[in-house]
Structure formats: structure tokens, C-alpha cells
Interface confidence: low
Amino acid sequence: ALPAKPENISCVYYYRKNLTCTWSPGKETSYTQYTVKRTYAFGEKHDNCTTNSSTSENRASCSFFLPRITIPDNYTIEVEAENGDGVIKSHMTYWRLENIAKTEPPKIFRVKPVLGIKRMIQIEWIKPELAPVSSDLKYTLRFRTVNSTSWMEVNFAKNRKDKNQTYNLTGLQPFTEYVIALRCAVKESKFWSDWSQEKMGMTEEEAPCGLELWRVLKPAEADGRRPVRLLWKKARGAPVLEKTLGYNIWYYPESNTNLTETMNTTNQQLELHLGGESFWVSMISYNSLGKSPVATLRIPAIQEKSFQCIEVMQACVAEDQLVVKWQSSALDVNTWMIEWFPDVDSEPTTLSWESVSQATNWTIQQDKLKPFWCYNISVYPMLHDKVGEPYSIQAYAKEGVPSEGPETKVENIGVKTVTITWKEIPKSERKGIICNYTIFYQAEGGKGFSKTVNSSILQYGLESLKRKTSYIVQVMASTSAGGTNGTSINFKTLSFSVFE
């Protein structure tokens, strides 16, 4: 049978390297040789390229080499397939070389801010060494912030006579590091170069863009003054690299603005000792380029009643995240402050906090919390300048098996009964929320029994035991990840009771 007709011919001119054409060969049952026939020099000349590979996948491609390729030019390309039964020709295809030229990528050699121009970086590059002198180049520049995965793109063209191989990328975030890549193509071509190697650049610094402010209220001291720990951090969306030289804080009683106190600090928290009345606290951050907008917070009076609106709250782990959800009875509350810190016996030093708006849930990546640590999580409703009563729960981002079992004792040994008591496992050893305890007991040489009780129970009475018999007993504490046994204890039931 005649060979199948070659279809889907496609040609690419790898500029100043080679012109490669490929095609779909069809299902060949016998050895087929292909010849690519070309006319070039605007139809003045012609030549052939013959596939010489014996493997079928390499036989569907053929290349013409320099010096018999110049641009601009028009080509006709036709592929002939030949086997022992005859020859079949493809359709004639027509190509303008400048439409199919593909260059090497450009080389970015510098990405820099331009002095005094905010939110802009200038990209400088070297044109591909091998690019048509007679054609303009078009470019796609893609960029993203270093901690993002999604690219933005801009397209532009450069005149071939343009010595200035630069592009000013504007509308960026201040003091932010960007990753830049560039590709180019001959203006008339449908083939883009590969992307250049990525290069980093940073926009100029600006005045800080703002602060978030929070407080921890402590009980009043003997003299009626109350310690208030002020906490602050860069506003959400502030540049990651934003630098601050210091903070100005001023505060005054709500009833008398004339009693304003001011302080400066370079720390990210401050302990104030305020009177029992309500206060306003304001602050700004500053750097060498200016000041941030003012952040303000109201501190309620000691006797002030705070509103309550959170009715129920729960935490669960889903897809590598700890999710906290709550229900509120106040429809007008749509901002919440979340506080979380490890439940350790000492004073919490590592209080973290974050605000949530327009939602009644909060998520945090599991890996931002320590595994097997219990966290206290509180949610404060916020309405205008008022902060409501918090709702608190405990949760683990990841539970493990307790690192030790309960310390167990045997009491009130009788003829057929005994009381097993155990202590709660220390917080640091629990590794999760204890959901239940299981008591395992077994007479010497006899069958084993077990009984599971909920985590609020710390003792259990065993009944229907055999008299004058040795038993072994063990208590297991379980979290959602599994259980750990305490040490086993031996006891022997009495042979008779005083009541017998």
C-alpha cells in the first residue's frame, strides 16, 4: 500500500541555527522515507532535505541549516513519503520566515529601583545575541512578589533602533522584592523565546503603611491602676521588608484629652499603667521616609461591662489547617480579634493575635503551630471602638499519642470489688485532648477485660471479681491519635470480708 499522506506540517526557524519542519507521518506498516522539498530565496532556489533516521519518531522531522537561510524570505515546503509501493505528496505549505522565527531568550542583567520614583522598578536586559537586525522585537515581561506563586504579565514592543533596552514596571508595592522574567519574539512571529532566567529586584522604601494595635488587659493592682500590655504589628498587606525605626505612642483619659502622655519605643510592645477610667491610645510608626497613619484603640474603664455575643465555638483540623468557627447573636458585629498562645503553666510570653472581618471563622496553617501543644484560643467581638467579652477554647493543631500513661493507684480492695484511681496526665505530656480512659484488667491466667470511661472520670470501681485472686490492672489515656498505657499494677482480692 502507498504510504499515508504527511499531514500537519509545522516549521520553526531557530534564528541563525536551523529551520526545522515536522509533520504527522500516519500509521506506516513498511519502511517509509521522507523528503522535504523547499523553495526559498523568494522562489528563486530549491533544495531537499531527506530523513536518514531509522526510528519512526525521528523520521517525522527534518532540518535545513545555515548559510542557506536568510531573513526575510518566503518558503514553500512540501513533504514526500516514499515506500516500495510508491510516492505520496503532502499539500504544499507556505511560510514567511519572519512569522516562524524563534530567538534565544533575552538576558536580564539588572533590575533596580529608580531613585526618587516610588513603586517602580526598571528592568534592563541584553537583546538575544542572535536576533534579526531587520525586525522589531516584542516582549512579555512577567513578574510576581517573591512569596507569591501567581505571575502577572505585561506586553510591550521595542523598536529595532532603540538602544535603550529597559522597561519601567510601575504600580508595584513599595519596598517589595519582585521576581522578573522576560521573553521576546520577532514582532511578526508566532513563536516566543523561552523565558529568560529570573532576576530579583526591589522597589524603593516608603513611609510605613500602617499598624494594627491590640491590648492585653490585666487585673487592677492594689493602688487601682491597671497594667495594660499594648501589642502592635505591621498592618496586613504591608510590604514584608518594610522597616521601622521606632514608634510614637500617646494616650489620654477619654474624659480629658489635656492629660495626654507620650512615649517613644523601638519595641513591639509596651506596658502601660493606666487609671481605672477609659482611655484612648494612639500610635504611629516611622522610618527615615516618614510616618505611618495613626492607629487608635480604646481601653475600657475597669468597671465597664463588655457585651457578649458569641454563643458557641468549636475547633477542628481540616486539610493541614486548624479551623475555628463560632456563632454570634449580634448581626452588626463583623470584626473579631483572635488571640492564641500555648497553654503552658508559666505566664504566656508568646501571645499571637490577628483580626478577622466579614467572617465567623478563622484558619491557621497547622505548621504555624507547634504539634502536640495545647493552645488557648480566644475570640473577641469588636463593634466600632468597643471590644466584647471573649469566648475561649482549647485546641491542638496536631494531636499525638500521650507521651506517658496515667499514674494509677488501687484503693478499697474487697473480696469482689476494687477502686482504680488515676491522675490526669500533666499538660506537657498529653499531646492532645484526652477523650477517654480505658481500664484493662485481667485475673492471673484468666481472660482480659476492659472498660472505657469519658475523660472527666478519674476513678472506676471494678466489680464481680474473683475472691483471693491476683489481678493486673492498667489504665490507658487516649487522644484522637491513640492511647498510651500507664504502668501496670498488681493487686489481690481479699479471701473474705468482715461482712461475711
Epitope: 538576558k107 542583567f109 539588572r110 533596580k112 532566567q197
Partner: antibody
């Protein structure tokens, strides 16, 4: 710990060529550009050029484009500089130096110990 | 090529003193300037890049300043290990060029 270990001192005859090696360790060799620098008379420093080990792409100071050729061997994390048609003017200490890259190109944050080349008949 | 000029060519100072080296470019190089220290018989060591950023592990007594064409490197409270030669180098494109150096000697 980042280290650039260069080959030892060389005494060569005028008109000959020679190759200096620079073995990198303690970092990802293909992730950083390698610069070559000449120091004459223990004073003047001159940038000869650079090579990107990732793709073998080289950039030369025009002054040295016919004097030096850079190559890399990714498998052994080694950069090489061949000096051609040596004359007494080429007697100097030659350094390889890693480009800091994140600090802006052409900032050399780690240097080899230097290779002393003496051209004499 | 951009020319870098350092002054003075040499200077003497005592331990505990403050010294300043200057470096001038013959055209605007913005903040693209690095400083290196080189001790006798050793390789240069990066001290400062982008005119004022200290390289990793460099003591805080070193500080860089300047932009455009005029730059300086200041060492507060000189230590015995600070004596040697200091070179500036622009990193504003290719080819990067070095200054002629300033030799700091013990008085």
C-alpha cells in the same frame, strides 16, 4: 560552609597557555554566577568576566575577551579559566569569586585564595 | 567603562580612632557600590554592598554611605584586625570596575 579552592601557583613561559581551576563547595554551584578577577602588583583589581554555571553562558570584559576563556564542569562543581598567549603583562594573582546575586549582580561575596601566575622565560 | 577613584591612597591611624575612606565614580552609579577589605597576602572580603548594606558577619563598626557619584566607608573605633587595604567597586552593570585602593596602616 562556602569554599572556593583554586589550583596552585604556576610559572609559565611566554606564548604558552594555561588553565586555572576553582572548585566550589558548600553551596549550589549552578545557582550562583562565578566571576574571575585579576590583581596585578598586589594592588590593582580588574574584573575579567563571569560565567553562569547553570547554562555555561559567559560575559567578558572587552579588555580580556581574547585573553581568557571560561568553562565549567557541573559534575565536579568546578569553574575553569584558560589564559591564552601569555606575556609578562599577565603575571598576576587571579581570583575566582562567587557572585552574591541576591545582593545585586557583580557583588563578590566569597573569593578563592588566589592563583599566582608568573610568566617568565 | 566607569572609573572609580579612591582617596587617600594611604592613611595612618591608631587603634580606637575613627577613619573614613572616600570613593568617587565618574558617572552616576546610584547605590550600586561595594567595599572590600584585603589583608596582606589574603583574598579580598566583601564588607558592604548597595552602598550601605553590611555583608554577613561584618562588624557594626563599619558603615557605608553615599549615592550617585560620592561614597564613603567609615570605621568607628579601629581594631588591630582592621588594618589592610580597602577597595571600592561599582556593581552598576558590566564591566564592574574597582578603585585603586586605600592602604590603612598603624600609626
Amino acid at each position: 560552609e562556602v569554599q572556593l579552592q583554586q589550583s596552585g601557583p604556576e610559572l609559565v613561559k611566554p606564548g604558552t597557555s594555561m588553565k586555572i581551576s576553582c572548585k566550589a563547595s558548600g553551596y549550589s554551584f549552578t545557582g550562583y554566577i562565578m566571576n574571575w578577577v585579576k590583581q596585578s602588583h598586589g594592588k590593582n583589581l580588574e574584573w575579567i568576566g563571569l560565567i553562569n554555571p547553570y547554562n555555561g553562558g559567559a560575559e567578558y570584559n572587552q579588555k580580556f575577551k581574547d585573553k581568557a576563556t571560561f568553562t565549567v564542569d557541573k559534575s565536579s562543581s568546578t569553574a575553569y579559566m584558560e589564559l591564552l598567549s601569555l606575556t609578562s603583562e599577565d603575571s598576576a594573582v587571579y581570583y575566582c569569586a562567587r557572585d552574591g546575586y541576591d545582593d545585586g549582580p557583580y557583588t563578590m561575596d566569597y573569593w578563592g585564595q588566589g592563583t599566582s601566575v608568573t610568566v617568565s622565560s | 567603562d566607569i572609573q572609580m577613584t579612591q582617596s587617600p591612597a594611604s592613611l595612618s591611624a591608631s587603634v580606637g580612632e575613627t577613619v573614613t575612606f572616600t570613593c568617587r565614580a565618574n558617572e552616576n552609579i546610584y547605590s550600586y557600590l561595594a567595599w572590600y577589605q584585603q589583608k596582606q597576602g589574603k583574598s579580598p572580603q566583601l564588607l558592604v554592598y548597595n552602598a550601605k548594606t553590611l555583608a554577613e558577619g561584618v562588624p557594626s563598626r563599619f558603615s557605608g554611605s553615599g549615592s550617585g557619584t560620592q561614597f564613603s566607608l567609615k570605621i568607628n573605633s579601629l581594631q588591630p584586625e582592621d588594618f589592610g587595604s580597602y577597595y571600592c567597586q561599582h556593581h552598576y552593570g558590566t564591566p564592574p570596575t574597582f578603585g585603586g585602593g586605600t592602604k590603612l596602616e598603624i600609626k
